[in-house]
């Protein structure tokens, strides 16, 4: 397994609709045709997988139908969007990139993007 550098923003603020987007960029040392991108969430020293997708270079990322993630790829950049976030989902979201094929296999893990999610205040009842 060979190491690869992965860069991602340090902080992102989710929109009021619970959507956060960030770019995950990897320094590809090889000529990979198949890339796997995994988003991991680290909170309270526990790491869980949020979503994952394998894609062919030049093609779109395809996450599972029930995934909260969507994404697009362009060269060595992956634009990731996570939806349906709530305040309790605030945490460090780590981008993991694997160059799956052809060999050699490369693995890169970013430092993580701290995503802050603020639940919107409910609209006060208004009398007309």
């Amino acid at each position: 397994c060979k190491a690869m550098h992965v860069a991602q923003p340090a902080v992102v603020l989710a929109s009021s609709r619970g959507i956060a987007s960030f770019v995950c960029e990897y320094a590809s040392p090889g000529k990979a045709t198949e890339v796997r991108v995994t988003v991991l969430r680290q909170a309270d020293s526990q790491v869980t997988e949020v979503c994952a997708a394998t894609y062919m270079m030049g093609n779109e990322l395809t996450f599972l139908d029930d995934s909260i993630c969507t994404g697009t790829s362009s060269g060595n950049q992956v634009n990731l969007t996570i939806q349906g976030l709530r305040a309790m989902d605030t945490g460090l979201y780590i981008c993991k990139v694997e160059l799956m094929y052809p060999p050699p296999y490369y693995l890169g893990i970013g430092n993580g993007t701290q995503i802050y999610v603020i639940d919107p205040e409910p609209c006060p009842d208004s009398d007309f």
Partner: antibody, heavy 120, light 110 residues
Framework: QVQLVQSGGGLVQPGGSLRLSCAAS????????MSWVRQAPGKGLEWVSA????????YYADSVKGRFTISRDNSKNTLYLQMNSLRAEDTAVYYC?????????????WGQGTLVTVSS | QTVVTQEPSFSVSPGGTVTLTCGLS?????????PSWYQQTPGQAPRTLIY???TRSSGVPDRFSGSILGNKAALTITGAQADDESDYYC??????????FGGGTKLTVL
Amino acid sequence: QVQLVQSGGGLVQPGGSLRLSCAASGFTFSSYAMSWVRQAPGKGLEWVSAISGSGGSTYYADSVKGRFTISRDNSKNTLYLQMNSLRAEDTAVYYCAREEGITGTGFDYWGQGTLVTVSS
Amino acid sequence: QTVVTQEPSFSVSPGGTVTLTCGLSSGSVSTSYYPSWYQQTPGQAPRTLIYTTNTRSSGVPDRFSGSILGNKAALTITGAQADDESDYYCVLYMGSGIWVFGGGTKLTVL
């Protein structure tokens, strides 16, 4: 345990076609790249073709490019080699082989081989 | 066209040590070529001995070892036994999904 069981060999005339199959069991087939390797009578091993675990990436030796097609059906745990425009020099025992682990740096398991004879 | 070279034949005495090599027609073999080694007896499928330069395949005795010696990949067999008499093939990874086998070495134990 890992098993690769091959079928589909036989006698075919020059210019003809043949499809080889390699049925896999004992491992998560879709997680492994696979290759075809052949051996002409009395000769050494020759790598023919490779395919990634998803089936999205394929590679060929120059000697078969444009004539052979590698494919896989992960729902059936089966690897295929479609051989068209066969020539006498394609006569060989054909082996399917699993590429080793996630790093894919070598072949760890082999099928039993199937003989393809191209002759009129 | 890159050619992978091996000694056509080699002989070793029982209990002796033999080193088979795998080179390139032009250039040096390094770990980046992920050399691997296979043993084949007549009429049988190849058996994997070593992959990724020096990793032994499961069930392979530690008499077999892989390394880089100078500008070639090497397979060393220590304490050679009669049933080591076989053909030995190396394969090198050329990048972009392409593998190239050497011509093989016929090892005789006598």
